[in-house]
């Protein structure tokens, strides 16, 4: 009886089970009653990452420097090339098809998480007791200066954008 289902790593064609081609190889011809499936290795800059019956290998992804991309991991006959972004840039999507400049955190905001090749900078507002007076992709919110530890007093209160201003204690008191 002709099979209706095949084992793992096989496929059904012309009422018989043929072996799939292994990763890194493409299908040249289906098996017959006399021959096994004929497969050929993918060429340079091509890949197939699964057991397959594809007649063409996929082209490796091109990491276009004009889009701010660079190769993170070179592709093989079984894996695609992995792109990442140049320093200071990050991917616009999970597929990393283009890059954008890391955002900076404005004054009053500090860096909660520094950007990576795949994620943008995450900013957070400086809470009471902290400030940031620069626009930066790296700087966290800094704590206000503690005047007391310097034996000084607060002359000007701090904000989320400015540090406190300390001054000498009033000696007349």
């Amino acid at each position: 009886e002709p099979p209706t289902a095949c084992r793992e790593k096989q496929y059904l064609i012309n009422s018989q089970c043929c072996s799939l081609c292994q990763p890194g190889q493409k299908l040249v011809s289906d098996c017959t009653e006399f021959t096994e499936t004929e497969c050929l290795p993918c060429g340079e800059s091509e890949f197939l990452d699964t057991w397959n019956r594809e007649t063409h290998c996929h082209q490796h992804k091109y990491c276009d420097p004009n889009l701010g991309l660079r190769v993170q991991q070179k592709g093989t006959s079984e894996t695609d090339t992995i792109c990442t972004c140049e320093e200071g840039w990050h991917c616009t999507s999970e597929a990393c098809e283009s890059c954008v400049l890391h955002r900076s955190c404005s004054p009053g905001f500090g860096v909660k998480q520094i950007a990576t090749g795949v994620s943008d900078t995450i900013c957070e507002p400086c809470p009471v007791g902290f400030f940031s007076n620069v626009s930066s992709a790296f700087e966290k919110c800094h704590p206000w200066t503690s005047c007391e530890t310097k034996d000084l007093v607060v002359q000007q209160a701090g904000t989320n954008k400015t540090d406190v201003v300390c001054g000498p204690q009033d000696r007349l008191r």
Partner: antibody, heavy 117, light 107 residues
Framework: EVKLVESGGGLVKPGASLKLSCAAS????????MSWVRQNSDKRLEWVAS????????YYPDNVKGRCTISRENAKNTLYLEMSSLKTEDTALYYC??????????WGQGTSVTVST | DIVLTQSPATLSVIPGNSVSLSCRAS??????LHWYQQKSHESPRLLIN???QSISGIPSRFSGSGSGTDFTLTINSVETEDFGIYFC?????????FGGGTKLELK
């Protein structure tokens, strides 16, 4: 018991034609691909032709393509090999074989073909 | 076409000894190789399929190994009934091809 019995061989002159037969028994003939393989006096084996179980697909090496025709009659459990424009290098013992698991799992006893002037 | 080269062409052996017969393919054929035995005045018979799979009814002293381009048929403790010619055959692609054979003879 699987049995393959070839017939039709003989002595012929170059350029002549010949039709070989193979009578199969002991298995469901229509479920199996079949092949012809020949063996010359040096004992070398050479594949000559194959035919799918249903008879729709036939396969030949380049050196016999156009001169040999493999066919089958499933109702009669019989395999054939028609050879034309025979050459001296076609002289050999011709075996009928069954394809099981992509191997030639059963062989007949062979029929002798001699092409000579 | 895939060329199969068998070596040695002839192998002289004393019964009880073990032997290894080689079959080399001109390109990778994965494990798509069969081994056949032909005794004197008999038809060939299938010994091993898919390079290493044993065939029902074939004595366990016969074993096959290899993949890609290099294959070996091993006969452990040769018996007198084992003398004859051994052929390898590839079924990786058309045309089907056989090796030239290795003749196993009595030393």
């Amino acid at each position: 018991e699987v049995k393959l019995v070839e017939s039709g061989g003989g002595l012929v002159k170059p350029g002549a034609s010949l039709k070989l037969s193979c009578a199969a028994s002991g298995f469901t003939f229509s479920n199996y691909g079949m092949s012809w393989v020949r063996q010359n006096s040096d004992k070398r084996l050479e594949w000559v032709a194959s035919i799918s179980s249903g008879g729709d697909d036939t396969y030949y090496p380049d050196n016999v393509k156009g001169r040999c025709t493999i066919s089958r009659e499933n109702a009669k459990n019989t395999l054939y090999l028609e050879m034309s424009s025979l050459k001296t290098e076609d002289t050999a013992l011709y075996y009928c074989t069954r394809a099981g698991g992509k191997a030639m799992d059963y062989w007949g006893q062979g029929t002798s073909v001699t092409v000579s002037t | 076409d895939i060329v199969l080269t068998q070596s040695p062409a002839t192998l002289s052996v004393i019964p009880g000894n073990s032997v290894s017969l080689s079959c080399r393919a001109s390109q990778s054929i994965r494990d798509n190789l069969h081994w056949y035995q032909q005794k004197s005045h008999e038809s060939p018979r299938l010994l091993i399929n898919y390079a290493s799979q044993s065939i029902s009814g074939i004595p366990s002293r016969f074993s096959g190994s290899g993949s890609g381009t290099d294959f070996t048929l091993t006969i452990n403790s040769v018996e007198t009934e084992d003398f004859g010619i051994y052929f390898c055959q590839q079924f990786n692609s058309w045309p089907l091809t056989f090796g030239g054979g290795t003749k196993l003879e009595l030393k």
